[in-house]
Amino acid sequence: MMCLECASAAAGGAEEEEADAERRRRRRGAQRGAGGSGCCGARGAGGAGVSAAGDEVQTLSGSVRRAPTGPPGTPGTPGCAATAKGPGAQQPKPASLGRGRGAAAAILSLGNVLNYLDRYTVAGVLLDIQQHFGVKDRGAGLLQSVFICSFMVAAPIFGYLGDRFNRKVILSCGIFFWSAVTFSSSFIPQQYFWLLVLSRGLVGIGEASYSTIAPTIIGDLFTKNTRTLMLSVFYFAIPLGSGLGYITGSSVKQAAGDWHWALRVSPVLGMITGTLILILVPATKRGHADQLGDQLKARTSWLRDMKALIRNRSYVFSSLATSAVSFATGALGMWIPLYLHRAQVVQKTAETCNSPPCGAKDSLIFGAITCFTGFLGVVTGAGATRWCRLKTQRADPLVCAVGMLGSAIFICLIFVAAKSSIVGAYICIFVGETLLFSNWAITADILMYVVIPTRRATAVALQSFTSHLLGDAGSPYLIGFISDLIRQSTKDSPLWEFLSLGYALMLCPFVVVLGGMFFLATALFFVSDRARAEQQVNQLAMPPASVKV
């Protein structure tokens, strides 16, 4: 792929920043080395540039190719390589650049931690919220549904915006927005439950902006194994934030003596993080790390983007696989603590629960396991992929497939072990979840490989939408429905309460196997789709007036 002047602007014609236009004009005149207006080497001090060593450049997938030579600064030629060696040109300092990009990735990951911390702080004090507002279980379900639905609906909108406008501004505004809404929601009077519902919907919109756009910035800051590592860190924020959310919720409530204060912690941190994003995250141009030039302006419509994504088989199959993961995590997260409590009732090691919270201890253990396995899974997945890439080009989807299929076995074993040993069940949960979570970062990486930079935010958004729609938006309810259906046809006893929920949860490993199959299908098309994406990026970087993608 050809190194042009620098990673470049947005599709759809809207510029990343007004300043970029001025920078580009200056760059075309006289290009400078590191610390200048920024060529391939740097984007100003601490910017997110990508260094060019001679005329060797990195492609979309991070592989190294020789760039064709030509007059410096000419569109379609490696102007950077030539000018970087020119008289008086300073070579970029990779260490400081790495630090700048590392700091940006760290801030984005911190933002993701806060996203989930905020979401799960509410989960941590949900019983208090229910008690205070007099919320019935169906009302608590409504809070969850409104959040997920607004998140789902908002994600594609932010995907569209994220591919066309200044991403860090959208990110910061999203964080400021949900922070303000969450903070305000801590003051909602008892009689206005509907305002609480509305606030959760608004928080869903705010958080959708972040979940959709942040990974694409990381995708534009790094390539290959570094990108996998950074996405791993970013996605480890999910279990970390979730765990911290539960801890924050309960500990702040205990310290302040009032659950309302629990909702005031994440907004304060959110405001700080939003400000840090504005200051420290560079306004990376799409495809920056992929060495794309100023000509990368895919002026394609949202409809054409969607058509292209639906035709991208690797993307479609990996999205369906992600939905399977989401289905399983959503269902297991909601029902496993209660299932294990019922197992203990059957084993006569616990009393039948008549007054909630039922299985509070199991919820705590399960939360801790989820937090740790999230970390372990992300690390294991990233490590395994890194190693497998040395053996095969299809490493990413294959590691995911093996993780999913292995996970299905251990999820099945949970229900076998639970009948006789709770410890055994927890071990199976531990291994099963580790394998299940091993594909989080890799799936994001697959998307970065097979989707061109100007469509990534839309792709992440659509994937988020489908994974919620087909996954955790309905799975907890479906499991509950199946369990009730089984229980209606059996005699009323603690044993059948346990068995009916177990049989219903057995749907999860089957869905996980299906997800594994989808990853195997992804592996079939991965290499060709990746090559096609690189080819499209080459076309985008070419000088012709109109580029059809």
Epitope: G134, D137, G139, F187, P189, Q190, Q191, N354
Partner: antibody, heavy 125, light 107 residues
Framework: EVQLVETGGGLVRPGSSLKLSCATS????????MSWVRQAPGKGLEWVAL??????????NYAESIKGRFTISRDDSKSRVYLQMNTLRDQDTATYYC????????????????WGQGVMVTVSS | DIVLTQSPPTLSVTPGESVSLSCRAS??????IHWYQQRSNESPRLLIK???QSIAGIPSRFSGSGSGTDFILSINRVESEDFSVYYC?????????FGPGTKLEVK
């Protein structure tokens, strides 16, 4: 029209038991939270116990003064709420009111929008 | 537990006068206060919910105000049927508690 009718009161000795019953009509009982509130002769009102609907797992809450001695329960098929009172004391002497909490489908108010006529319970040796 | 204090314990007024009954909470309870009227030998009835929200069937002369810790029940031009005991109740947190009551009597 909403109606709450309490029965089961009377004169009992300290340490004995009594079960109050409240028959309801005029609203969807299974979706509604119910409470018992008492009033000692010449004194103010005191909340005793609350039972939520099945959509809240029929969770029960009690005042500290009666916790462990009184049990609130409900029978949705009969639209009735009960208060089982064990180990009765002199200070439990009061008029016991069956009350209804206003319902909003997704949530419920903790205030009492309808009250029964009350039933007298006298604990005396 | 949240303690509610009502003042004055007894209030003597002549019919046609306007009165204000006070209820103070031991901690901030937003607007989670409700007012009841109990006539002699009758069951209580709900007058005002959430500090200021009116109830269907209750005369418009009854109104409520306040937030946080201090609340007022106002009766505009007292009528003969209004002479009874008034209780405030908090629902901010369990256990649900009532104030000791204010008795409104004829002067």
């Amino acid at each position: 029209e909403v109606q709450l009718v309490e029965t089961g009161g009377g004169l009992v000795r300290p340490g004995s038991s009594l079960k109050l019953s409240c028959a309801t009509s005029g609203f969807t009982f299974s979706d509604t939270w119910m409470s018992w509130v008492r009033q000692a002769p010449g004194k103010g009102l005191e909340w005793v116990a609350l039972i939520k609907d099945k959509n809240s797992n029929s969770e029960a809450n009690y005042a500290e003064s009666i916790k462990g001695r009184f049990t609130i329960s409900r029978d949705d098929s009969k639209s009735r709420v009960y208060l089982q009172m064990n180990t009765l004391r002199d200070q439990d002497t009061a008029t016991y009111y069956c009350t209804r909490h206003e319902d909003f489908y997704y949530y419920s108010g903790y205030y009492f929008d309808y009250w029964g006529q009350g039933v007298m319970v006298t604990v005396s040796s | 537990d949240i303690v509610l204090t009502q003042s004055p314990p007894t209030l003597s007024v002549t019919p046609g006068e306007s009165v204000s009954l006070s209820c103070r909470a031991s901690q901030g309870i937003s607007t989670s206060i409700h007012w009841y009227q109990q006539r002699s030998n009758e069951s209580p009835r709900l007058l005002i919910k959430y500090a200021s929200q009116s109830i269907a069937g209750i005369p418009s002369r009854f109104s409520g105000s306040g937030s946080g810790t201090d609340f007022i029940l106002s009766i505009n031009r007292v009528e003969s049927e209004d002479f009874s005991v008034y209780y405030c109740q908090q629902t901010y947190s369990l256990p649900l508690t009532f104030g000791p009551g204010t008795k409104l009597e004829v002067k």
